[in-house]
């Protein structure tokens, strides 16, 4: 186990020519904050892909105003170092994402708004307890001046963390078969304590706590055999050759996980999953009370009053699991209001609102119907973001606000002229047409087509269309 | 626990204010948005206004906007609602409550007491 | 505004009874709908979140459902303590709005 720490020097122009403007001004002052992903390996993954070595934030940086006219200088950073914490050994070599945010602090509505203002990438190789390294990234018209290393939490050590030190027991040399852990000669490499009862002809440990059964032998604490007797040497034979199962060597070989917890495999490394009671990485942890705390990211721990009653974590939204500790993809819950893009930034969600939609998740509708008047007796249809108003005869615009011209739309057939008048318009129709909108023909021996012209109406006289 | 405590009610006649407060005990304040809503006599919950956690963004009921202020003093882990231009129809128990966190759901999770206000002459 | 029609207004029922309480929306809310109690005493208290998720020291005996438009609260059992106002929101759209209640009274 150990940490990977990243201290961002400068964030600002890069050198050359197109110098971009500052993210901030007077109207919108921001501050800056970054994500740091790691994962292992060399491998170009897709910035989506799961930040499987861990990621981390860093608190935001200092309000910042443009100076108007000024350059964009260095902007101001957070204070601190990112720290990403890695459960099992540093893989040595690895690739990382650094993105830097803006937050706008502005008085627009849905409170502040975050928004990327440049993202780097790289593949690195590093030892673990190695001096700092220092790097200079460019993302288009931005530079970012950074350094980086890996330590191992004590007692772990090495370019990986995975030998273990102790203190020298004597002041002169370590126990046999122990050499002294450089860089710290002060202390001793610690043998490896297994899980309790592991059998010691058939299992091993990587791992403190861990039993880990050789070929042919399975159980939590290697001690049963898989098939039959001819595969019981410690590296017995194929199971080509004898028809034995041989496990693979998966990361739940054995089960790491005690206390009847199941384990399944992750892409990395295994996970347990612990009965009540228990918990930790192997379900190690037991005779655990509400007392205890064992519920985090603020779950309700009920009942448990003593070691021997089971409690019990009620998770706050957004966090699952025995004891609250899984955080829930909280994108797959949706939250993003109307048909907004949700962004999980590790320490918040961000929805991205489509036209029409505002609000931490979208959940504002600008342009709905309340508040907002037609005139001239229009009414206001709403839908999905956008509201129009449905305009009483005579009158148009977004809000009925303009007078309509009756006869833009050419509304009389038949070559008939129309006029403009207060009640709406009136068509003059062409000989041989007659009706509102001249629409009907006249026949030759002067009947006309339904419907029959009012009694006083001659065809050919200009008609009212109220 | 979280615990929700209103104060401030009391008789105010049309026209007048009256600033409630909530105090907020038990969770980080600083990490939930906070609601306000109220109940006339003999009649159902109204959602009156509510503020983020930062407190950069609040919304209003349509009845109460340009009338009601929502606020809150995050180191002092309270909650404020200005009430001006009092209308009778404005009498009611108000409730503080807490928003889920990240407002992923818009929930109230937890409700104060409510503390009474009566708007008469 | 998105409107919040509750039935029944009321109902009686009996201890060990199933209730069933149904909540309509005039527009899809997407399943952002919760349920609260009320107490006569005034105390109000979230039962269920997102449609269907339990809030925390909620007894199992409630449940909610639906999607779209409808949705329903269920008590599979009413207990003594469960006689009360029951109240559906949603939480899509502002303004938050909630259905005009449901008075569970002993028969």
């Known amino acids: 186990a150990g940490v990977f720490e990243l201290q961002i020097h400068s964030f600002g122009p890069g050198p050359g020519p197109g110098a971009p403007r500052s993210p901030c001004s007077a109207r919108l002052p921001c501050r800056l904050f970054f994500r740091v992903c790691l994962k292992p390996g060399l491998s170009e993954e897709a910035a989506e892909s799961p930040c499987a070595l861990g990621a981390a934030l860093s608190a935001r940086g200092p309000v910042y105003t443009e100076q108007p006219g000024a350059p964009a200088p260095d902007l101001p950073l957070p204070d601190g170092l990112l720290q990403v914490p890695f459960r099992d050994a540093w893989p040595g070599t690895f690739s990382f994402i650094i993105e830097t945010w803006r937050e706008e602090l502005g008085d627009q509505i849905g409170g502040p708004a975050w928004s990327l203002l440049a993202r780097v990438a790289g593949r690195r190789r590093l030892a673990a307890g190695g001096p700092w390294a220092r790097d200079i990234q460019r993302a288009g018209a931005w530079e970012l001046r950074f350094s980086y290393r890996a330590r191992c939490e004590p007692p772990a050590v090495g370019t990986a963390c995975t030998r273990l030190c102790r203190p020298r027991s004597a002041p002169s040399r370590c126990g046999p078969g122990l050499r002294p852990c450089a860089p710290l000669e002060d202390e001793c490499e610690a043998p490896l304590v297994c899980r309790a009862g592991c059998s010691p002809e058939h299992g091993f440990c990587e791992q403190p706590g861990e039993c880990r059964c050789l070929e042919g032998w399975t159980g939590p604490l290697c001690t049963v055999p898989v098939s039959t007797s001819s595969c019981l040497s410690p590296r017995g034979p194929s199971s080509a050759t004898t028809g034995c199962l041989v496990p693979g060597p998966g990361p739940c070989d054995g089960n790491p996980c005690a206390n009847g917890g199941s384990c399944s495999e992750t892409p990395r490394s295994f996970e347990c999953t612990c009965p009540r009671g228990f918990y930790g990485l192997r379900c190690e942890v037991s005779g655990v009370t509400c007392a205890d705390g064992p519920c985090f990211n603020g779950g309700l721990c009920v009942g448990g009053a003593d070691p021997d009653s089971a409690y019990i974590c009620h998770c706050p939204p957004g966090f699952q699991g025995s004891n609250c500790e899984k955080r829930v993809d909280r994108c797959s819950l949706q939250p993003c209001r109307n048909g907004g893009l949700c962004l999980d930034l590790g320490h918040a969600l961000r929805c991205r609102c489509r036209a029409g939609f505002a609000g931490p998740r979208c959940e504002h509708d600008l342009d709905d119907c309340a508040g907002r008047a037609c005139a001239n007796g229009g009414t206001c249809v709403e839908g999905g973001g956008a509201h129009r108003c449905s305009c009483a005869l005579g009158f148009g615009g977004r809000d009925c606000r303009e007078r309509a011209d009756p006869c833009a739309a050419r509304p009389c057939a038949h070559g008939g002229r129309c006029y403009a008048h207060f009640s709406g318009l009136v068509c003059a129709c062409a000989p041989g047409y007659m009706g509102a909108r001249c629409e009907f023909p006249v026949h030759p021996d002067g009947a006309s087509a339904l419907p029959a012209a009012p009694p006083g109406l001659r065809p050919g006289d200009p008609q009212r269309y109220l | 626990e979280v615990q929700l405590v209103e104060s401030g009610g009391g008789l105010v006649q049309p026209g007048g204010s009256l600033r409630l407060s909530c105090a907020a005990s038990?969770?980080?304040?600083?990490?939930?948005?906070m609601h306000w809503v109220r109940q006339a006599p003999g009649k159902g919950l109204e959602w009156v206004a509510y503020?983020?956690?930062?407190?950069?963004?609040?919304y209003y009921a349509d009845t109460v906007k340009g009338r009601f202020t929502i606020s809150r003093d995050n180191a002092k882990n309270s909650l404020y609602l200005q009430m001006n231009s009092l209308r009778a129809e404005d009498t009611a128990v108000y409730y503080c409550?807490?928003?889920?966190?990240?407002?992923?759901?818009?929930?109230?999770?937890?409700w104060g007491q409510g503390t009474t206000v009566t708007v008469s002459s | 505004d998105i409107q919040m029609t509750q039935s029944p207004s009321s109902l009686s029922a009996s201890v060990g009874d199933r209730v069933t309480i149904t909540c309509r929306a005039s527009?899809?809310?997407?399943?952002?709908l919760n349920w609260y109690q009320q107490k006569p005493g005034g105390a109000v208290k979230l039962l269920i979140y997102?449609?269907?998720r339990l809030h925390s020291g909620v007894p199992s005996r409630f449940s909610g459902s639906g999607s779209g438009t409808d949705y329903t609260l269920t008590i599979s059992s009413l207990q003594p303590e469960d006689f009360a106002t029951y109240y559906c929101?949603?939480?899509?759209?502002?303004?938050?709005?909630f259905g005009g209640g449901t008075k569970v009274e002993i028969k």
């Open positions: 409550a807490r928003g889920d966190y990240e407002d992923i759901f818009y929930t109230m999770d937890y």
């Open positions: 527009r899809d809310i997407t399943k952002f």
């Open positions: 503020i983020s956690s930062g407190g950069y963004t609040s």
């Open positions: 997102y449609t269907s």
């Open positions: 929101q949603q939480g899509n759209t502002l303004p938050w709005t």
């Open positions: 038990g969770f980080t304040f600083s990490d939930y948005g």
